[in-house]
């Protein structure tokens, strides 16, 4: 899987979208998990409603929400009040039994709030060195690695 980078501003909300084939994943619940290193396990953060037909209902775990448009084939995750510690590698998953298919790998980057000068020294600004090389801009808040590109293995 390529990794898509989503950038959000500290203190604001960030929406992550994960498109998928609605027919292929028909009847499957979805989940959002946080990966502990690029080769590490993925820890479940939040999953869609236990009843697949109610997947459109937003479910929260702390400041993270998930909702699934099962007809359109888009899983949406909202990270509210984004903080530096929310930065990291995540996965959108499609669940079947005890197995999970990866729909998308996501790197969340937290940018400084340009209006908050008090904490400006504590957060990353766009334009600084990036974790992934040669990534192209997909749209305003996300970008994908080029086909075949391998992200740096990150540091602990």
């Amino acid at each position: 899987h390529n990794t898509t980078v989503f950038q959000g501003v500290a203190g604001q909300s960030l929406q992550v979208s994960c498109p998928y084939d609605s027919m292929k994943h028909w009847g499957r619940r979805k989940a959002w998990c946080r990966q502990l290193g690029e080769k590490g396990p993925c820890q479940r953060v939040v999953s869609t409603h236990n009843l697949w037909l109610l997947s459109f209902l937003r479910r929260w775990n702390g400041s993270t929400a998930i909702t699934d448009d099962t007809l359109g084939g888009t899983l949406t995750i909202t990270l509210r009040n984004l903080q530096p510690h929310d930065a990291g590698l995540y996965q959108c998953q499609s669940l079947h039994g005890s197995e999970a298919d990866t729909l998308r790998k996501v790197l969340v980057e937290v940018l400084a709030d340009p209006l908050d000068h008090r904490d400006a020294g504590d957060l990353w600004f766009p334009g600084e060195s990036e974790s992934f090389e040669d990534a192209h801009v997909e749209h305003s808040i996300s970008r994908s690695l080029l086909e075949g590109e391998i992200p740096f293995p990150p540091t602990s």
């Epitope: 080769k39 990353w124 060195s129 740096f152 602990s156």
Partner: antibody, heavy 120, light 107 residues
Framework: QVQLVQSGAEVKKPGASVKVSCKAS????????IHWVRQAPGQGLEWMGW????????KYAPKFQGRATITADTSTSTAYMELSSLRSEDTAVYYC?????????????WGQGTLVTVSS | DIQMTQSPSSLSASVGDRVTITCHAS??????LSWYQQKPGKAPKLLIY???NLHTGVPSRFSGSGSGTDFTLTISSLQPEDFATYYC?????????FGQGTKVEIK
């Protein structure tokens, strides 16, 4: 028991090459990234490079590019670091280090270190 | 390369003291900072990852904080086994780089 066991101490002459091995037990090296870090006597830690044993991809610190070669043999769960054109300032303890990569790896294993002495 | 600067380079403290070591990055590194402890003749040991997360088995007297460019390792009550050298390491970009180390000695 999870551990990384490195090869023994080496004494080399300037201009020679040295190859240090790092054998993993208790886990599969392809599930990890293997890094090499060195430490000259009385000095700090210096990252040299890494390999992804799963596909053989490697990356080096600019200082070691072209002089260090990191390889891995998944069949024996062993990683290697070869350093060529040795000079006296390469005298150091060389460590291998396994982790799950960037972005919050909770796994962190180190070899016991291999002392490489370069002396004429 | 990203430069990591630790301070102080050495300090003397007594058992029970609160000790603070700082690490400054030359560029923003988000929260991608680890702290290691190293004792003479031994390999480094991970204490803190992702700036503030305590590694498994590490005593709770160790804590880390910071994001962006400035980070802190705190030992709330120094114990005899804590006398060692401490290194910060950035993991925002490659090459990974370490601070020069802070040696914590017995006063």
């Amino acid at each position: 028991q999870v551990q990384l066991v490195q090869s023994g101490a080496e004494v080399k002459k300037p201009g020679a090459s040295v190859k240090v091995s790092c054998k993993a037990s208790g886990f599969s090296i392809e599930d990890f990234y293997i890094h090499w870090v060195r430490q000259a006597p009385g000095q700090g830690l210096e990252w040299m490079g890494w390999i992804d044993p799963e596909n053989g991809d490697s990356k080096y610190a600019p200082k070691f590019q072209g002089r260090a070669t990191i390889t891995a043999d998944t069949s024996t769960s062993t990683a290697y670091m070869e350093l060529s054109s040795l000079r006296s300032e390469d005298t150091a303890v060389y460590y291998c280090h396994a982790d799950h990569g960037n972005y919050g790896s909770t796994m962190d294993y180190w070899g016991q270190g291999t002392l490489v002495t370069v002396s004429s | 390369d990203i430069q990591m600067t630790q301070s102080p380079s050495s300090l003397s403290a007594s058992v029970g003291d609160r000790v603070t070591i700082t690490c400054h990055a030359s560029q923003h590194i988000n929260v991608w900072l680890s702290w290691y402890q190293q004792k003479p003749g031994k390999a480094p040991k991970l204490l803190i990852y992702k700036a503030s997360n305590l590694h498994t088995g590490v005593p709770s007297r160790f804590s880390g904080s910071g994001s962006g460019t400035d980070f802190t390792l705190t030992i709330s009550s120094l114990q005899p086994e804590d006398f060692a050298t401490y290194y910060c390491q950035q993991g925002q970009t490659y090459p990974r780089t370490f601070g020069q180390g802070t040696k914590v000695e017995i006063k």
